[in-house]
């Protein structure tokens, strides 16, 4: 039986009986949150064989090895993972082994073992045998290997029974409990999996089979299964499905979906079976079983229930991500938040067409609305009182709407109403009217020039740069001295600048009123000698980059009491010099013949300009006649170390303690201070933690249903 | 105090353009106030021609759009009326007002000109 | 465009006297904002217009108490409480809601 579309077992150990006859479970297992220690020895779950998704296991008490549970589980398909893992074991406080001595693949996918106080068995899997590779891997925080003292069947008795393989340099007995052997197949196979007797399945067989070279007789498939039968690819008139079977048209049409009762059904895209029209298509019409290739962004309409999307928060913007048609009205209130700007274009910046009204209010945290960056239509079907589709009232910081000179923003019906946005100069209000065409639907209480700016430099004069020079990472630039109306006026000037790798950056790029800012700035004061142009070097920049660079004056002036005149440049776009580039990285070397050797690189992180060429040194080196002195046989001492108790917030020590002359005696000395890359691997590991941890936590907690 | 001031030729031939001139003193251009134009034939009431701000945004009469242009001069403290294709109907007092938002109405006028169409 | 129909078309008054000149619109004058988009300008013979009133109910800087303005929604009224001999010439009423402004056909108030 195919059991699915995922299976989430948790509080109540009974619910494991839902397993009973599942084959292959289509989808992912969930074991999880059951904290009363139960006896797991009356459940066997012996037909399940494959997992097409990943397996999950987490705060389970009481359950002590998975062997009894699952005895033949065999592969883990990873067709879908779960934070980039197929098998997660975490915070298992009573497991003391996997004991999955029949998994032979896990075809995509890593695996992530963390927080088993008291698990063991770890170092004696292989398991470059079951996944392709091993290097993302994920074993910390669990019993100490010293402590385990794990041995595999027959050591005791100098009979052992089990194969040995190297891992990091270390040739051993490789074993899932005291009693199972990790099952090996002879190497005349190759990649091809065997039967327990040794011989080599057919090679579309994933994991084992039952007969030799039979494709009938397969556990599980490599590619995809059939009719009973494992195929490279699916026959003429079937689709790929799951990512491990092939199913008819018919069967693909009657699929309900498992997110949704009211979904539009499954489609066939490029011979797959699939809940959705992959990114960058969409159906065939709403019917339709088949997708043909989106113009620009797919359309994805999102529908609010209330009529009304209320924006407060990041939080509630996240609903919006992925949409471009928003049929309702958005009401935007952001008083507050944390690079709030990026964050909003990320969650909204698709949305190209609102059929209601937007009305922006007490949104103190915006600079400018720039996050909706593809907003092309406000279609006004629905308006507020007094017939208003765009609405903006009482926004502190709020200075742009959008670059017009790059924006075409249509209203098509309804007016516009802006009042008490202190920085927000009516000359870009005006300018929106003509983009907008709402120009005379307008009356004189919809747009006051008196609390509309009142608190900015509506008022700009233009600063002319006079000069840039640059180097590898400097750029020196000057302009022309600014003379307000009242030379006292002026007060300093700001320079901003950014890498720019295009010439597309606006004033208010990630810039909100919470301190957000993706410019940097230096304030510049004004030169003591009258007759000296202002300039400024800024250093510290990366050699062969394009930086944006514009400045403001900083003035008190007033035009008639009423609005503040400023003073400010274009964007000027000015590239550092080219330097030497950083070193070319993951430098290997291999000999392929008593006379040639193969090296190879890759590209350095840092070019610093155009890369034209490598040079490549080689010397002979004389042989080294240490290599002939040490003793490989001899086993290193036995490292000193501290032990896990299932966090990992203790430090592990697996390196051996220098002995050195310290203070005229020999013995151990203080380790050494890490060093800044040590540290910062440090941080990065620790922050890996935290965000994984968010991650599994986010997905498996959910409320309880109603 | 701010006081505007038109000028311009008084008589205007048929189907030529109109231009008039309204300096503005006593003030800056830049104020947050609307620039007006109004019109009033002898003997007749009064005609919004359009206005305009010192950003250039402009609105205009729909019954004399296609015919009328206004624009602003900043750095002399300036702004014009352009009428073109002028015929008899529109010989009229012309005057240039400000709309202000402090008193949210036209607070200043000008003496207002005189310009006749004739041949 | 939103038409402005003032009456009478002539009034004339005894010096001390009150006197009063309607104003009525073909649509309502009332924003959203809670203002009502109605000035009241006089033009004195020979001279240009003055605002009186503006908000449909606000006095004008330096325009004396005598002139109030009052009404909403669609139908004004300008009130002088006594008419002095100064306050002759033409009254008109203009509306700022919509584009494009429009003023009234005028009321020429005379002394009998």
């Known amino acids: 039986e195919i059991c699915g579309p995922g299976i989430d077992i948790r509080n109540d150990y009974q619910q494991l009986k839902r397993l009973e006859n599942c084959t292959v479970i289509e989808g992912y297992l969930h074991i999880l949150l059951i904290s009363k220690a139960e006896d797991y020895r009356s459940y066997r779950f012996p037909k399940l064989t494959v997992i097409t998704e990943y397996l999950l296991l987490f705060r389970v008490a009481g359950l002590e090895s998975l062997g009894d549970l699952f005895p033949n589980l065999t592969v883990i398909r990873g067709w879908k993972l779960f934070y980039n893992y197929a098998l997660v074991i975490f915070e298992m406080t009573n497991l003391k082994d996997i004991g999955l001595y029949n998994l032979r693949n896990i075809t995509r996918g890593a695996i992530r073992i963390e927080k088993n106080a008291d698990l063991c068995y770890l170092s004696t899997v292989d398991w470059s045998l079951i996944l392709d590779a091993v290097s993302n891997n994920y074993i910390v925080g669990n019993k100490p290997p010293k402590e385990c003292g794990d041995l595999c069947p027959g050591t005791m008795e100098e009979k052992p029974m089990c194969e040995k393989t190297t891992i990091n340099n270390e040739y051993n007995y490789r074993c899932w409990t005291t009693n199972r052997c990790q099952k090996m197949c002879p190497s005349t196979c190759g990649k091809r999996a065997c039967t327990e007797n040794n011989e080599c399945c057919h090679p579309e067989c994933l994991g084992s089979c039952s007969a030799p070279d039979n494709d009938t007789a397969c556990v599980a498939c490599r590619h995809y299964y059939y009719a009973g039968v494992c195929v490279p690819a699916c026959p003429p008139n079937t689709y790929r499905f799951e990512g491990w079977r092939c199913v008819d048209r018919d069967f693909c049409a009657n699929i309900l979906s498992a997110e949704s009762s009211d979904s539009e059904g499954f489609v066939i895209h490029d011979g797959e079976c699939m809940q959705e029209c992959p990114s960058g298509f969409i159906r065939n019409g709403s019917q339709s079983m088949y997708c043909i290739p989106c113009e620009g962004p797919c359309p994805k309409v999102c529908e609010e229930e209330k009529k009304t999307k209320t924006i407060d928060s990041v939080t509630s913007a996240q609903m919006l991500q992925g949409c471009t048609i928003f049929k309702g009205n958005l009401l935007i209130n952001i008083r507050r938040g944390n690079n709030i700007a990026s964050e909003l274009e990320n969650f909204m910046g698709l949305i190209e067409v609102v059929t209601g009204y937007v009305k922006i209010r007490h949104s103190h945290a915006l600079v400018s609305l720039s996050f909706l960056k593809n907003l092309r239509l406000i279609l006004g079907e629905e308006q507020l009182e007094g017939n208003y589709s765009f609405y903006v009232l009482d926004n502190q910081n709020l200075q742009q709407l959008w670059d017009w000179d790059h924006r075409n923003l249509t209203i098509k019906a309804g007016k516009m109403y802006f009042a008490f946005n202190p920085k927000l100069c009516v000359s870009e209000i005006y300018r929106m009217e003509e983009v907008t065409g709402t120009k005379g639907r307008q009356s004189k209480g919809d747009i006051n020039t008196r609390n509309n700016g009142e608190r900015a430099s509506c008022e700009s004069d233009v600063l002319h740069f006079t000069s840039t020079t640059t180097s590898k990472n400097r750029i020196i630039i000057t302009w022309h001295r600014y003379r307000p109306p009242d030379y006292r006026d002026l007060i300093s000037f700001t320079v901003y600048y950014k890498e720019a790798p295009f010439k597309n950056v606006t004033e208010y790029d990630g810039q909100d009123a919470c301190g957000s800012n993706s410019w940097n700035m230096v304030d510049v004061d004004l030169p003591p000698n009258k007759d000296v142009e202002p300039g400024i070097l800024l250093h510290g920049l990366k050699p062969w980059t394009q930086y944006a660079v514009y400045v403001k004056a900083v003035t008190l002036t007033m035009v008639e009491n009423d609005h503040i005149r400023g003073a400010k440049s274009e964007i000027l776009y000015i590239r550092t010099n080219a330097s030497v580039p950083s070193i070319p990285l993951d430098v290997l070397s291999a000999s392929n013949s008593s006379s040639q050797l193969i090296v190879k690189w890759n590209p350095p992180s840092l070019p610093n300009g155009n890369l034209s060429y490598y040079i490549v040194r080689w010397q002979r080196q004389p042989q080294d006649g240490y290599l002939y002195r040490h003793n490989y046989c001899s086993k290193d001492k036995i490292p000193i170390r501290k032990y896990a108790d299932g966090t990992i917030d203790i430090e592990e020590v697996t390196e051996n303690p220098k002995t050195e002359v310290c203070g005229g005696e020999k013995g151990p000395c203080c380790a050494c201070p890490k060093t800044e890359a040590e540290k910062q691997a440090e941080k990065e590991e620790a922050e890996y933690r935290k965000v994984f941890e968010n991650f599994l936590h986010n997905s498996i907690f959910v409320p309880r249903p109603e | 105090q701010v006081q505007l001031q038109e000028s311009g030729p008084g008589l205007v031939k048929p189907s030529g353009t109109l231009s008039l001139t309204c300096a503005v003193s006593?003030?800056?251009?830049?104020?947050?106030?609307?620039w007006s134009w109004v019109r009033q034939p002898p003997g007749k009431g009064l005609e919004w021609i359009g206005e305009?701000?010192?950003?250039?945004?402009?609105n205009y009469n729909p019954s004399l759009k296609s015919r009328v242009t206004i624009s602003v001069d900043k750095s002399k403290n300036q702004f014009s009326l352009k009428l073109s294709s002028v015929t008899a109907a529109d010989t009229a007092v012309y005057y240039c007002?400000?709309?202000?938002?402090?008193?949210?109405?036209?607070?200043?006028w000008g003496q207002g000109t005189l310009v006749t169409v004739s041949s | 465009d939103v038409v402005m129909t003032q009456s009478p078309l002539s009034l004339p008054v005894t010096p001390g006297e009150p006197a009063s000149i309607s104003c009525r619109s073909s649509?309502?004058?009332?924003?959203?904002?809670?203002?009502?988009?109605l000035d009241w300008y006089l033009q004195k013979p020979g001279q240009s217009p003055q605002l009186l009133i503006y908000?449909?109910?606000n006095r004008a800087s330096g325009v004396p108490d005598r002139f109030s303005g009052s009404g909403s929604g669609t139908d004004f009224t300008l009130k002088i409480s006594r008419v002095e001999p100064e306050d002759v010439g033409v009254y008109y009423c203009?509306?700022?809601?919509?584009?494009?402004?429009?003023f009234g056909g005028g009321t020429k108030v005379e002394i009998k």
């Open positions: 305009i701000y010192h950003s250039g945004s402009t």
């Open positions: 007002a400000r709309y202000s938002y402090g008193t949210v109405g036209i607070d200043y």
């Open positions: 649509q309502s004058l009332l924003h959203s904002n809670g203002y009502t988009y």
């Open positions: 203009m509306q700022a809601l919509e584009m494009p402004l429009t």
């Open positions: 006593g003030g800056s251009i830049s104020s947050s106030n609307w």
């Open positions: 908000l449909g109910s």
